[in-house]
Amino acid sequence: LEVSESPGSIQVARGQPAVLPCTFTTSAALINLNVIWMVTPLSNANQPEQVILYQGGQMFDGAPRFHGRVGFTGTMPATNVSIFINNTQLSDTGTYQCLVNNLPDIGGRNIGVTGLTVLVPPSAPHCQIQGSQDIGSDVILLCSSEEGIPRPTYLWEKLDNTLKLPPTATQDQVQGTVTIRNISALSSGLYQCVASNAIGTSTCLLDLQVISPQPRNIG
């Protein structure tokens, strides 16, 4: 018995179905086919779980969280024992193993391994200003999304006036900050943060209004 090489890893957007491939070749009939799918979740690597089981011509549910969401892609028994997972969740991310036994065919590689990563688009980021908005001050524009896998990158742009960040601005695309030194009246305006990753983007807006010093009456 020989389980074929798997593609290594699969990526899927949260909520979308995933197909985890596993095919094998055997010299024996499929009368005594036994297939166990296991997962080692990324969130709990020392707690493997059973996903689905085929034994004695019957299918059995695995861990409760997979109930109603998992099944074999084809009619069993078959040499294609790939499974689907519907409505994928973040907790489904992990390393999946298909263990195949088909007596009396023993020997060879009977395990296939596939990684599954459930991707999450960035949630609506939160924009805020840190620092004084008085003319001549330094300000930091902050942007962060609570959710996002892979981790989002953050890009700031100016939506009005000259449509560009001033030369004194420095961006940190990982932290989601833009630091603007020595702000002037021209720094005022609407700024947009674009949080993006492999499967989506999300934005927030921020209105920076630079405060000019008020002339003081002397008397």
Partner: antibody, heavy 121, light 110 residues
């Protein structure tokens, strides 16, 4: 080589449409705001439209507002100008221009060679 | 007509100095930066001055810029035959949320 290369110009009838493209190379496209500038035969420069780094912000000259649409595709390093309801007075050489990151104000530090748009019946 | 006013033409002899003015208002030049461009016949414009008085690398120091109130000025010293071109000022106008060029000035080197 750092350059901008416009294409898509040609002869079009009044009321017609045209889409100009500007392909950028040699620099990080998404780090610059960009503009379209035109020049009618024998006339001066006229700014047409501008767009921010990721396209969230756009500006238009009053003469083209509601008829022209500026857009960009950062994955293709390309700037576009969709021109609808064209008029004879839109006849001009159209340049794409890059706004300098070193300047506080507007400063076009890189220009394309231009593409000619002729609106005539 | 442009909201930025430039003289249609200026002329001077080689080696001389020439200035080109760009007049606007508080809603454009008065509260914003000015840039200047040179356009040789049949070619695309070239940036000469940005942020009122800064020169990009490669622009000779014969070219200078200044701003006072609602007017900007481009100065060219040691005039050369190859300086014969059209010159344009550019700024941003807060009132209309647009960029605006001056009408252009044709420089003739006598």
């Amino acid at each position: 080589e750092v350059q901008l290369l416009e294409s898509g110009g040609g002869l079009v009838q009044p009321g017609g449409s045209l889409r100009l493209s500007c392909a950028a190379s040699g620099f990080t496209f998404s780090k610059y705001s960009l503009s379209w500038v035109r020049q009618a035969p024998g006339k001066g420069l006229e700014w047409v439209s501008a767009i921010s780094y990721y396209g969230g912000g756009t500006l238009y000259a009053d003469s083209v507002k509601g008829r022209f649409t500026i857009s960009r595709d950062n994955s293709k390093n390309t700037l576009y100008l969709q021109m609808n309801s064209l008029r004879a007075e839109d006849t001009a050489v159209y340049y794409c221009a890059r706004d300098s990151r070193d300047a506080y104000g507007v400063a076009f530090d890189l220009w394309g060679q231009g593409t000619m748009v002729t609106v005539s019946s | 007509a442009s909201v930025l006013t430039q003289p249609p033409s200026v002329s001077a002899a080689p080696g001389q100095k020439v200035t080109i003015s760009c007049s606007g208002s508080s809603s454009n030049i008065g509260n914003n930066y000015v840039s200047w461009y040179q356009q040789l016949p049949g070619t695309a414009p070239k940036l000469l001055i940005y942020d009122n008085n800064k020169r990009p690398s490669g622009i000779p120091d014969r070219f200078s810029g200044s701003k006072s109130g609602t007017s900007a000025t481009l100065g060219i010293t040691g005039l050369q035959a190859e300086d014969e071109a059209d010159y344009y000022c550019l700024t941003w106008t807060g009132a209309g949320r647009i960029f605006v060029f001056g009408g252009g000035t044709k420089l003739t080197v006598l």
